[in-house]
């Protein structure tokens, strides 16, 4: 009798382990979105970046949704959010309108239920990009741990979008779920 | 009968829990590698940094391998990768040959199966380090979430390696596994 | 008989799953602390920042303790630590004492058992904030993976604290546990 129970238990446990493992995988949303440079707005004012890749090169998404330029949370949880934004200018691209630049990124959260937008993280620098140098470059990295609810949306705003580096290794943002909400 | 089954089940579950816990621990690779300054190359061009500590001070590694200057993935998964690179110069360390510097880091992935190298993340800044100031410092931080396969290698390239800050709290890179691949 | 065992097993497994899930949640400490600007020290020297929020806005803490300006570890483990520090100055705030600034952050670990303090991560930049520009801004981000023991304390030191940006999206630090220690 007990031998039969043991065998049966092992079988049941095995399938439960598979199920648990599978559900655990499905319960870990993530995204890594890279800039889509075909549609970067011009100007020097703060703008929301809406064109991102989610399924080519390093870009990927799972159990989150990318829609209308926003990363949408499908599952409540605590997430680590990050962004890397690179700005660059070469003299062959024409003269800068001003040598004094404010190169900034803002990672914002929008709640649909209560239509409001809040900045979770910001970073950047004021720069003096003199005409004496033929090439200029600057990168910003921000990251932090935030409670996100299903339906909330993450977006990226930057100043001077025309100076963005369009490479996938340069300008990207992402998120991965670390744990559930108690 | 059912009391005996309960007791047996508790015992089996207990050992399974131990096993699961142990295997989970063993299934979470990580590394935090700090610069080994005894062998930093000179020059101002982009070079791959091959000397890193993996077992002293803050440096540590588990279920990943460090070999030939590269961090080797032993287990498929999604990993969070990061790097912090500090550059510094004091006037006593020699006169700067140029004030216009490009201080950059590139985190690259090399696949052995398909011999190719790709940049996952980059960051940095062009800097004007005038001889009028006795000390200069600049740090770069990059991080991102990437799918890595067993056998793939992560390495760090920088410009101006002779300006690297050799402290373990300054120049380091690392990775930790967040989840399996579906 | 076996049907009864199966039902009983499912019930026991169900409760065990709840318990495991619950204990797993409780076993994942985290903190995200935002600057409390009501008590920022003045001066340009390196100081420890002791005033942080842990329960308002984006700030939160679980299974860690915030006391006397330090984030205290309650549970052994490997943690990802991060900090984002923003400095800014507007001409309306008065003239800077010097245009040459060292804007730095140091993330330190203090062990009570062995009374010693060590820097885990540092970052920053020397900056020339000329009087020609009415506004200056600069952000630092650092992050890394560290083994922390119960009772150890994490604190933040910065240079030029009077220049700190007091916004919760600007100046913060945090930690989350990734895995147990083997």
């Amino acid at each position: 009798g007990s031998q039969h129970i043991r065998a049966e238990k092992a079988m049941v446990d095995g399938s439960w382990l598979d199920l648990a493992k599978r559900s655990k995988l499905e319960a870990q949303p993530f995204a890594h979105l890279t800039i889509n440079a075909t549609d970067i707005p011009s100007g020097s004012h703060k703008v929301s970046l809406s064109s991102w890749y989610h399924d080519r090169g390093w870009a990927k998404i799972s159990n989150m949704t990318f829609s209308n330029g926003k990363l949408i949370v499908n599952q409540d949880g605590f997430y680590y959010l990050y962004a890397n934004i690179c700005f660059r200018h070469h003299e062959t691209s024409g003269d800068l309108a001003t040598e004094y630049l404010q190169l900034m990124v803002y990672v914002t959260k929008t709640s649909i239920k209560i239509p409001s937008s809040h900045t979770l993280m910001k970073g950047g620098s004021t720069k003096y990009w003199s005409g004496n140098s033929e090439f200029h470059f600057y990168s910003i990295n921000v990251g932090g741990f935030f409670k996100l609810r299903s339906g909330e949306e993450i977006s990226i705003e930057v100043s001077n979008p025309s100076l963005l580096d369009p490479d996938q290794d340069a300008t990207y943002f992402g998120a991965f779920k670390v744990r559930d909400i108690d | 009968g059912s009391q005996h089954i309960r007791a047996e089940k508790a015992m089996v579950d207990g050992s399974w829990l131990d096993l699961a816990k142990r295997s989970k621990l063993e299934a979470q690779p990580f590394a935090h590698l700090t610069i080994n300054a005894t062998d930093i190359p000179s020059g101002s061009h982009k070079v791959s940094l091959s000397s890193w500590y993996h077992d002293r001070g803050w440096a540590k590694i588990s279920n990943m391998t460090f070999s030939n200057g590269k961090l080797i993935v032993n287990q498929d998964g999604f990993y969070y990768l990061y790097a912090n690179i500090c550059f510094r110069h004091h006037e006593t360390s020699g006169d700067l040959a140029t004030e216009y510097l490009q201080l950059m880091v590139y985190v690259t992935k090399t696949s052995i199966k398909i011999p190719s190298s790709h940049t996952l993340m980059k960051g940095g800044s062009t800097k004007y380090w005038s001889g009028n100031s006795e000390f200069h410092f600049y740090s770069i931080n990059v991080g991102g979430f990437f799918k890595l396969r067993s056998g793939e290698e992560i390495s760090i390239e920088v410009s101006n390696p002779s300006l690297l800050d050799p402290d373990q709290d300054a120049t380091y890179f690392g990775a930790f596994k967040v989840r399996d691949i579906d | 008989g076996s049907q009864h065992i199966r039902a009983e097993k499912a019930m026991v497994d169900g409760s065990w799953l709840d318990l495991a899930k619950r204990s797993k949640l409780e076993a994942q400490p985290f903190a995200h602390l935002t600057i409390n600007a009501t008590d920022i020290p003045s001066g340009s020297h390196k100081v420890s920042l002791s005033s942080w929020y842990h329960d308002r806005g984006w700030a939160k803490i679980s299974n860690m303790t915030f006391s006397n300006g330090k984030l205290i570890v309650n549970q052994d483990g490997f943690y990802y630590l991060y900090a984002n520090i923003c400095f800014r100055h507007h001409e309306t705030s008065g003239d800077l004492a010097t245009e040459y600034l060292q804007l730095m952050v140091y993330v330190t670990k203090t062990s009570i058992k062995i009374p010693s303090s060590h820097t885990l991560m540092k970052g920053g930049s020397t900056k020339y904030w000329s009087g020609n520009s009415e506004f200056h801004f600069y952000s630092i981000n650092v992050g890394g993976f560290f083994k922390l023991r119960s009772g150890e304390e994490i604190s933040i030191e910065v240079s030029n604290p009077s220049l700190l940006d007091p916004d919760q999206d600007a100046t913060y630090f945090g930690a989350f546990k990734v895995r147990d220690i083997d």
Partner: antibody, heavy 122, light 108 residues
Framework: EVQLLESGGGLVQPGGSLRLSCAAS????????MSWVRQAPGKGLEWVSG????????YYADSVKGRFTISRDNSKNTLYLQMNSLRAEDTAVYYC???????????????WGQGTLVTVSS | EIVLTQSPGTLSLSPGERATLSCRAS???????LAWYQQKPGQAPRLLIY???SRATGIPDRFSGSGSGTDFTLTISRLEPEDFAVFYC?????????FGQGTKVEIK
């Protein structure tokens, strides 16, 4: 071929001034840091001064600081050393030398000009 | 500043012999940032070695450099008649850049 040709040396009284020139050819002058090195008669070599390619940063040995000024005119491919308040111990052959440009700090000297003799005597 | 001391002051050798010149620094030279020069009478110095051991363009392979930290060596494996001259070491790992006082290699 890289060539460096110094001129402007001669006899000068203590307290007097002299301006040395170094005409460069065979390389993109503005891309390289340059230096002046001197050698007193029968003695060893002493670095005197250096300047970055852009001319934005200048460096001096303590023995000449405040008296000598290094400069360059990149449009003329010429390096200068303005020497004021000259002393007897400044008597030497003055060489101009090119930095290799391979490292971010000024390093070795290659090549050197043939030198110009400065004699400070009353 | 870093003081470089060269020894011996004078080395008397015959053509075909091996010459070993020493350069000792008063403190560690960062990154093996040391160069060697040869100077013949009435001529400007000529670069032989940089980075402690890298031969400059056009320098014969009988010249070799070694060392790190505070002790550096220039070796001429087989002296040729044209090799007799004064040799200087120079460090560039710290400001100011400094030279040794020189070693004269003369024909015995």
């Amino acid at each position: 071929e890289v060539q460096l040709l110094e001129s402007g040396g001669g006899l000068v009284q203590p307290g007097g001034s002299l301006r040395l020139s170094c005409a460069a050819s065979g390389f993109t002058f503005s891309s390289y840091a340059m230096s002046w090195v001197r050698q007193a008669p029968g003695k060893g070599l002493e670095w005197v001064s250096g300047i970055t390619g852009s001319g934005g940063s200048t460096y001096y040995a303590d023995s000449v600081k405040g008296r000598f000024t290094i400069s360059r005119d990149n449009s003329k491919n010429t390096l200068y050393l303005q020497m004021n308040s000259l002393r007897a111990e400044d008597t030497a052959v003055y060489y101009c030398a090119k930095d290799p440009g391979t490292t971010v700090i000024m390093s070795w000297f290659d090549p050197w000009g043939q030198g110009t003799l400065v004699t400070v005597s009353s | 500043e870093i003081v470089l001391t060269q020894s011996p002051g004078t080395l008397s050798l015959s053509p075909g012999e091996r010459a070993t010149l020493s350069c000792r620094a008063s403190q560690s030279v960062r990154g093996r940032y040391l160069a060697w020069y040869q100077q013949k009478p009435g001529q400007a110095p000529r670069l032989l070695i940089y980075g402690a051991s890298s031969r400059a363009t056009g320098i014969p392979d009988r010249f070799s450099g070694s060392g790190s930290g505070t002790d550096f060596t220039l070796t001429i494996s087989r002296l040729e008649p044209e090799d007799f001259a004064v040799f200087y070491c120079q460090q560039y790992g710290s400001s100011p850049r400094t030279f040794g006082q020189g070693t004269k290699v003369e024909i015995k």
